[in-house]
């Protein structure tokens, strides 16, 4: 009876996500068969989040809208480990929008999910950010410095990275 009600709950939760994510890839968390964590297929997972590399070229605002339609946001990078994971899936000759913008052009950077901007956990390329009307951030590869962030115009179409919390069923 307990297993039946758990299964019913799982199915109703899966139905919630079915509209945007018809297929989920789930793994068992820990030793308890009751706990599964899922990411939409073919998103990748790291710690408690799922990531999707969008290869369509869009402006920052459209990229964020695109992520939100999928129940995600443009990526918020919280640690060096997280960035190191993300870059494994990026192409060196491309740039990708992050969920980081400076709408006022006053170098008051803000993350899309309201995570406080911490200057100590940023990975700007040297000399960046460098331009008050470049109000959106990308991650890209520079041969001298490897992967890092750069400020660019928000209206320039780029690829992007979406991030959402894992789905627990």
């Amino acid at each position: 009876n307990f297993m039946y009600s758990k299964t019913v709950k799982r199915l109703s939760k899966l139905r919630e996500y079915q509209q945007y994510h018809p297929s989920l890839t789930c793994v068992m968390e820990g030793k308890d068969i009751e706990d599964w964590s899922c990411c939409p297929t073919p998103w990748t997972s790291f710690q408690s989040s799922c990531y999707f590399i969008s290869t369509g070229m869009q402006s920052w605002t459209k990229s964020q809208k695109n992520c939100s339609v999928m129940g995600a946001d443009l990526v918020v990078i919280n640690t060096r480990e997280e960035q190191d994971f993300i870059i494994q899936n990026l192409k060196r000759n491309s740039s990708y929008f992050l969920g980081l913008s400076d709408p006022g052009g006053r170098r008051h950077w803000q993350w899309v999910d309201q995570t406080p901007y911490n200057e100590n956990v940023t990975f700007w390329h040297s000399g960046e950010p460098n331009n008050l009307d470049e109000r959106c951030a990308i991650i890209n590869f520079r041969s001298s410095e490897e992967w890092g962030w750069n400020d660019i115009h928000c209206h320039v179409p780029q690829k992007s990275i979406c991030k959402m919390k894992k789905i627990y069923i």
């Epitope: 920052w60 605002t61 709408p103 460098n130 009307d133 470049e134 660019i152 209206h155």
Partner: antibody, heavy 123, light 111 residues
Amino acid sequence: EVQLVESGGGLVKPGGSLRLSCAASGFTFSSYTMSWVRQAPGKGLEWVAYISSGGGQTYYPDSVKGRFTISRDNAKNSLYLQMNSLRAEDTAVYYCARHDYYEGGLYYAMDYWGQGTLVTVSS
Amino acid sequence: DIVMTQSPDSLAVSLGERATINCKSSQSVDYDGDSSMNWYQQKPGQPPKLLIYAASTLESGVPSRFSGSGSGTDFTLTISSLQAEDVATYYCQQTNEDPPTFGGGTKVEIK
């Protein structure tokens, strides 16, 4: 007073080249993204190119990509448009315009325009 | 590219009457409550002049008879009481995504 003055237009044969200049004054030129916008005789406005304030970013529509090059010299408060492989359909008045980003926003408008310089491509 | 469609192509209005110009974008040009819609006025033989930015904010020095409204894909420029000096062609423009694109223009004349 903000002023933008274009020069360098004229008559050129198809396949020829021309370099337009825009002299800026009355504002801190090095702080602004700049654009070239053109208008064919009796027609509407068509954006041609822009360049970021430091010159690191340039962008072009497909209609001119590979033929036109925008550049700037912040020390001289000058904007340039090098036009190669010119075609009859490039005939237009070319305006330089300044981008001004909305206060507290991610978007911009073109708040100052020069008087324009006429480019005629004809054999 | 985002296509901007203006209507009507031309408009004849009596002095002191209201003139309304519409602009429709092929996709939304909004984000987080802001619109990347601008309106310009161009008089014969002159460069364009910025009238309204962010859909509804009047540029400094522009008479208050000009107003802008709309969001998403549908925008309107209104001249509440047409004056002789308002005879011009009016253009809408989006700057949400490159390339920035203009509408085809609406020519306003006096009836």
